[in-house]
Interface confidence: medium
């Protein structure tokens, strides 16, 4: 007998998703319109290209990066696309409502689409910790809650701490990591006997995960520079991110070999560590004055990432039920913190150099921003985890974790799981 969604989910998912989509269409109908200003064509094309880079990162990069499970690769890629498509729509509306709504209409520009794609990327980072343990109906809830939480966090940080788009979006790494880890903590953990093989990686899915990592690696400079307004800041952000990710690749591969008793290279370490430099320089990529400094950060980030990948999975597997290959959550949590600390250090050195007596205040503001991001991530993550545990979502049974056949039709298979 072929494996199916439970009957209740077959009713629940299409109804839930299509009702939500209809509601979004109505909201777009009543509250949005396109930017009618005279756009410079050259600027328009350049702006679109950045948005396109972000979409490639989200759909292909993060989609394939999370596809390394032996029996869950289809779901990883397709569910990522589903979440991205839904997340972008909701993020555009939410950002518009939070920032423009007093005018009565939300003006959609290429910049707002870029912002929305980055907000949706947050979900794709977080979901790495729970993919395989939840169904699409639950992922819809996760998208809505996380995009809403991130949007509100950004608005609060912008208003209280007076930070620009780039700075308040660069909390995305820490926010997404802690959100994902706290959701994972709430979900049922123990894998029953006999299903351990399903959360292991296989060669072909691992190759596609490496492809995802390569796409992310290529486009990470676009991500770190996407929200910077000034062309010069953007140029420096691109350069510094490029140098950082270049060094983190070399560090990841050599560090992975160093960490193995026989000097072998771990695919899992490499998938994630190649991105380490990009995450670490994210917050301060436009402020770093020299390539050498970005390269040092890439080196440190690569080492932290490999070290984390070696020693943290055991802990994360026991406490959070996160499989060994889903290392994005704790990787980003460590590297995001590193990036924030680097920014604070630059801030301190900056204010010392200027003979400014406000060092303590500035550092306090930065720590306040970071703490707020972590607290909101943990709280909203726990709330999401509790919501996902509700019976109405008909979550997959633990015995059917990490199994594409629960969700997909495979005509060539005579029997189901």
């Amino acid at each position: 007998m072929s494996s199916k969604y439970p009957r209740s989910v077959r009713r629940c998912l299409p109804l839930w998703a299509l009702t939500l989509e209809a509601a979004l269409i109505l909201l777009f109908y009543f509250f949005t319109h396109y930017d009618a200003s005279l756009e410079d064509q050259k600027g328009l094309v350049a702006s679109y290209q950045v948005g396109q880079d972000l979409t490639v990162m989200a759909a292909i990069g993060l989609g394939f990066l999370t596809s390394s499970f032996r029996r869950h690769s289809w779901s990883s890629v397709a569910f990522n696309l589903f979440m991205l498509a839904l997340g972008v729509q909701w993020a555009i509306l939410l950002d518009g409502f939070l920032s423009q709504f007093p005018s009565g209409k939300v003006v959609i520009t290429l910049f707002s689409i870029r912002l929305a794609t980055m907000s949706a990327l947050s979900v794709l980072i977080s979901v790495d910790a729970v993919l395989g343990k939840v169904n699409l109906a639950q992922l819809v809830v996760m998208v809505l809650v996380e995009v809403t939480a991130l949007g509100n966090l950004r608005m609060v940080i912008s208003n209280i701490f007076n930070t620009d788009y780039h700075m308040n979006m660069m909390h995305i790494y820490v926010f997404a990591a802690y959100f994902g880890l706290s959701v994972a903590w709430c979900l049922p953990k123990p894998l029953p006997e006999g299903t351990e093989d399903k959360d292991q990686t296989a060669t072909i899915p691992s190759l596609s995960a490496m492809l995802g990592a390569l796409f992310l690696w290529m486009f990470w400079p676009s991500f770190n520079s996407a929200l910077l307004r000034s062309p010069i800041e953007r140029k420096n952000a691109v350069f510094n991110t490029y140098y950082a990710v270049a060094v983190s690749v070399v560090t990841a591969i050599s560090g992975s070999s160093l960490a193995h008793p026989q000097g072998k290279i771990s695919k899992t370490y490499v998938h994630s560590a190649v991105l380490a430099g990009g995450v670490a320089v994210g917050t301060s990529c436009h402020l770093i004055p020299s390539p050498w400094l970005a390269m040092v950060l890439g080196l440190v980030a690569g080492l932290i990432s490999v070290g984390g990948a070696k020693y943290l999975p055991g802990c994360c597997n026991r406490v959070l039920g996160i499989p060994h290959s889903s290392i994005m959550g704790y990787n980003f949590s460590l590297l995001g913190l590193l990036g924030e600390i680097i920014y604070i250090v630059l801030l301190v050195l900056d204010t010392v150099g200027a003979g400014n007596g406000m060092i303590g205040f500035q550092v306090l503001l930065s720590i306040g921003e970071l703490s707020l991001a972590i607290v909101i991530a943990l709280m909203s993550g726990l709330l999401t985890g509790l919501l996902l545990n509700l019976k109405i979502w008909k979550a997959p049974h633990e015995a059917k974790y990490f199994d594409d056949q629960v969700f997909w039709k495979f005509p060539h298979l005579a029997v189901g799981f």
């Epitope: 756009e39 410079d40 050259k42 600027g43 328009l44 350049a46 702006s47 910049f111 007076n162 620009d164 307004r229 000034s230 062309p231 010069i232 800041e233 953007r234 140029k235 420096n236 301060s284 436009h286 402020l287 770093i288 004055p289 400094l293 630059l346 050195l349 900056d350 204010t351 150099g353 200027a354 400014n356 406000m358 205040f361 500035q362 503001l365």
Partner: antibody, heavy 130, light 108 residues
Amino acid sequence: QVTLKESGPVLVKPTETLTLTCTVSGFSLNNARMGVSWIRQPPGKALEWLAHIFSNDEKSYSTSLKSRLTISKDTSKSQVFLTMTNMDPVDTATYYCARTPITMVRGAIRLYYYYYMDVWGKGTTVTVSS
Amino acid sequence: DIQVTQSPSSLSASVGDRVTINCRASQSIGTYLNWYQQKPGKAPNLLIYAASSLQSGVPSRFSGSGSGTDFTLTISSLQPEDFATYYCQQTYSTPTWTFGRGTKVEIK
């Protein structure tokens, strides 16, 4: 020689939309180190920054007026436009456009980006009245 | 938004006097502060950028200092053509670059 010249209607009725044009010469709107800002000054009052456009077409707006303002440019004609909707008598002011270069200073440990308005137009006076 | 407060709002001085105008930001803005001079019926003119850098063509009697929240514009020896209104402006915080309310320097 760098010059900026504002043009637009002298009189606007309340609730109407104001469109101002700034025609620049002596520098290129494509220059990565150059932007253009709009500033206004009501009679007898202080200067108020309204909006800014960078060479890469990124824009910044005054928080309080963001919902009413649109800045754009036509690089081929060396023109920058400011559109302000739902005009009110309190919007009566002299409107200036100004070249806004970005100076990058390399510190010991970080980069600094300084923005300032170094060349201003003469201004155009707009009265909002029915 | 970051607010900038200028003091005094007006002052009277004689030619040759040393004049100082203060500007205070509501939060630390590093050295992202500019000073402008505006004469009646004219457009403003940039004097100082980045708190202390003198704009080319501006007489050396004008100088700027300060960082963080407190800034000062000093005119070492006031000249007849210096009687005008002076504005400070912060460019630390995007998207809004705010101006002070101005200081009017009048003849005593």
